[in-house]
Interface confidence: low
C-alpha cells in the first residue's frame, strides 16, 4: 500500500486584494479513509478554513468534486481576498475515528502573502528643451508594489534602450516598494514625433506590464535653417524677397524684416506648413520698393525661435539694370 503524501506544491502564493486565491493540495493515496480539512496556522489556535462535511464557508469553493470516492484533489479557492487572509494554509488529512476523526498527516503548508500592484508608471522629461544630438534624461517612477522583485525597461519608438539606471527602495523589508529609473536619450532631429516608454513588469500584473509614456516633442527644440532669396521677376519698381525658415520645432517663432537696418512692419504674406516629421516650415514674402535714386538695399530676415537668440540672414539688392543676388551667412 502506497504511503499517503500530502502535496502542497506552492511554498508561497502571492495574491492581490479582491482577487481569488487557489490553494492546491493533492494526495497520493485514498487511504486511510477520512476527510481532508483546511486550516490556517498550526497548533490549538489554528483556524478552520474549510470542512466539506460541516460548517458554512461562503468564500471557499472546491476545485474538484469532493463527493467522488476516487477524488485526490482537495484544492480550494478563496474569493475576495482581504489583508486579513494572509497566513500559512495547511491541508490536513484525518482518518475516521470514534468519537472524533483523528489527524493523520499534514501538508507542508502554503504561505499566502499579499502582492500589491505597482502604480501606473509616471515618466517625466527634462525641464527645458534641448537640441538634437544632445542627451536628455527621463525619469520613471512607480510606487506601492510588493514583493520587491520588479522589472523595468525603457523604449524609444519600440526600440529598447540600454542607458539607464534603476533603484528600488527601500533596500530592506517593507510592506510596499518604489522604483525610480533614469534613462539617457540622445535626441535625433526627427524625434518630434517620438515617444519614450517606461515599462514595468511585476508578478501581480500577470504578464500584462504597465506603461508610462513621454513625448519627445516636449523635450526637443529643432532650430530653424534660414534662406533669403530674391525672386527673379520684378513688378514695376518692386522686388519680391522670400525668407524660408525650415525644419523648426516647436512652432513658437517671431520673424521680422529689416531694410538697411530699419525694422519694417510690413509683410506681404506668409505661410506655415507642417512636415511629416512634425517640424514646421515658415515662408515670408517681402516686397521692396526700388527706385533709380536709391542706394543699394540690404534686407535682413531675423528669426527668434522659442525664446532663443535671434538668427538672421541678409540679402543685398543692387539697384542696377541687372540685379545681382547676394546673401551672407547667418549672423546672431
Amino acid at each position: 500500500e502506497e504511503e499517503l503524501q500530502m502535496i502542497q506544491p506552492e511554498k508561497l502564493l502571492l495574491v492581490t486584494v479582491g482577487k481569488t486565491a487557489t490553494l492546491h493540495c493533492t494526495v497520493t493515496s485514498l487511504l486511510p479513509v477520512g476527510p481532508v480539512l483546511w486550516f490556517r496556522g498550526v497548533g490549538p489556535g489554528r483556524e478552520l478554513i474549510y470542512n466539506q462535511k460541516e460548517g458554512h464557508f461562503p468564500r471557499v469553493t472546491t476545485v474538484s468534486d469532493l463527493t467522488k470516492r476516487n477524488n485526490m484533489d482537495f484544492s480550494i479557492r478563496i474569493s475576495s481576498i482581504t489583508p486579513a487572509d494572509v497566513g500559512t494554509y495547511y491541508c490536513v488529512k484525518f482518518r475516521k475515528g470514534s468519537p472524533e476523526n483523528v489527524e493523520f498527516k499534514s501538508g507542508p503548508g502554503t504561505e499566502m502573502a499579499l502582492g500589491a500592484k505597482p502604480s501606473a508608471p509616471v515618466v517625466l522629461g527634462p525641464a527645458a528643451r534641448t537640441t538634437p544630438e544632445h542627451t536628455v534624461s527621463f525619469t520613471c517612477e512607480s510606487h506601492g508594489f510588493s514583493p520587491r522583485d520588479i522589472t523595468l525597461k525603457w523604449f524609444k519608438n519600440g526600440n529598447e534602450l540600454s542607458d539607464f539606471q534603476t533603484n528600488v527602495d527601500p533596500t530592506g523589508q517593507s510592506v510596499a516598494y518604489s522604483i525610480r529609473s533614469t534613462a539617457r536619450v540622445v535626441l535625433d532631429p526627427w524625434d518630434v514625433r517620438s515617444q519614450v516608454i517606461c515599462e514595468v513588469a511585476h508578478v501581480t500584473l500577470q504578464g500584462d506590464p504597465l506603461r508610462g509614456t513621454a513625448n519627445l516633442s516636449e523635450a526637443i527644440r529643432v532650430p530653424p535653417t534660414l534662406e533669403v532669396t530674391q525672386q527673379p521677376m520684378r513688378v514695376g519698381n518692386q522686388v519680391n524677397v522670400t525668407c524660408q525658415v525650415r525644419k523648426f520645432y516647436p512652432q513658437s517663432l517671431q520673424l521680422t524684416w529689416s531694410e538697411n537696418g530699419n525694422v519694417c512692419q510690413r509683410e506681404t504674406a506668409s505661410t506655415l506648413t507642417e512636415n511629416k516629421d512634425g517640424t514646421y516650415n515658415w515662408t515670408s514674402w517681402f516686397l521692396v520698393n526700388i527706385s533709380d535714386q536709391r542706394d543699394d538695399v540690404v534686407l535682413t530676415c531675423q528669426v527668434k525661435h522659442d525664446g532663443q537668440l535671434a538668427v538672421s540672414k541678409r540679402l543685398a539688392l543692387e539697384v542696377t539694370v541687372h540685379q545681382k543676388d547676394q546673401s551672407s551667412d547667418a549672423t546672431p
Partner: antibody, heavy 120, light 107 residues
C-alpha cells in the same frame, strides 16, 4: 450570447415535487456558482440556495432544508433545482442566477424565471 | 440570519427627480451589498455590487454608498425607464438575504 435559459411553467398538486432546469450558455459554466431565488406573486425575492458545479458544493436556505436539492450536470452546463412536498405557498416564479465573482455574493446574470403553481 | 430592511417601501417621484433608497443590515456586512432593479414580469437586474461599484452597462445616474450596516442607492435624475422595484441584497454570508423592496412609482 451569455444567458441562462430556464424550463417552462409547471402546475403541481400539493405534496408533489417539481424539478426546474437552468441551462447556461456563452460562458464557462463550471467557473461560476449558481443560486436559486424565488418570488411569490406580489412578494419580494427569497434566496433558496447555492451550488457550485466545480466541486458540487451546495448551501441551502434553512427553511427549505430537506425539501430542496440542487444539482448540476456539467456535460450539458445545466443546473437543477428540485423542490419536494410542495405546498400552496411554494407558488412562485423560480429564478436561477449566476454569482458574479467580481465581488462577494451578487448575481449578474439571471434566467427569465419559471412559474410554478401549486394548486389542488 | 442577517435581516435586510429597506425604506421606504414605496416612493412617488417625477422624471428628473433625485431618488434615494436606504437599506439597513441587522449586523455588519462590510461592503458586501448589491442593488437590483426589477420590472413587472422580468428578472432582477444587477445595478450595484460591493456597495458602490456600478455594474457594467448600468447608467451612471445610479450610485451606491455605505458600509457596515447602512447603505444607500441614489438615482440622480429619474428617467421614465427607472420606474420599477429596487431590492438590496447582502452577500457577506449564507444565507443570502434580500430587502423587502422599494417600489418607485410615477407621481
Amino acid at each position: 450570447q451569455v444567458q441562462l435559459v430556464q424550463s417552462g411553467a409547471e402546475v403541481k398538486k400539493p405534496g408533489a415535487s417539481v424539478k426546474v432546469s437552468c441551462k447556461a450558455s456563452g460562458y464557462t459554466f463550471t467557473g461560476y456558482p449558481i443560486s436559486w431565488v424565488r418570488q411569490a406573486p406580489g412578494q419580494g425575492l427569497e434566496w433558496m440556495g447555492w451550488i457550485y458545479a466545480y466541486g458540487g458544493n451546495t448551501n441551502y436556505a434553512q427553511k427549505l432544508q430537506g425539501r430542496v436539492t440542487m444539482t448540476t450536470d456539467t456535460s450539458t452546463s445545466t443546473a437543477y433545482m428540485e423542490l419536494r412536498s410542495l405546498r400552496s405557498d411554494d407558488t412562485a416564479v423560480y429564478y436561477c442566477a449566476r454569482e458574479a465573482g467580481s465581488s462577494w455574493y451578487d448575481f449578474d446574470l439571471w434566467g427569465r424565471g419559471t412559474l410554478v403553481t401549486v394548486s389542488s | 440570519d442577517i435581516q435586510m430592511t429597506q425604506s421606504p417601501s414605496s416612493v412617488s417621484a417625477s422624471v428628473g427627480d433625485r431618488v434615494t433608497i436606504t437599506c439597513r443590515a441587522s449586523q455588519g456586512i462590510s461592503s458586501w451589498l448589491a442593488w437590483y432593479q426589477q420590472k413587472p414580469g422580468k428578472a432582477p437586474k444587477l445595478l450595484i455590487y460591493a456597495a458602490s461599484n456600478l455594474q457594467s452597462g448600468v447608467p451612471s445616474r445610479f450610485s451606491g454608498s455605505g458600509s457596515g450596516t447602512d447603505f444607500t442607492l441614489t438615482i440622480s435624475s429619474l428617467q421614465p425607464e427607472d420606474f420599477a422595484t429596487y431590492y438590496c441584497q447582502q452577500g457577506a454570508s449564507f444565507p443570502i438575504t434580500f430587502g423587502g423592496g422599494t417600489k418607485v412609482e410615477i407621481k
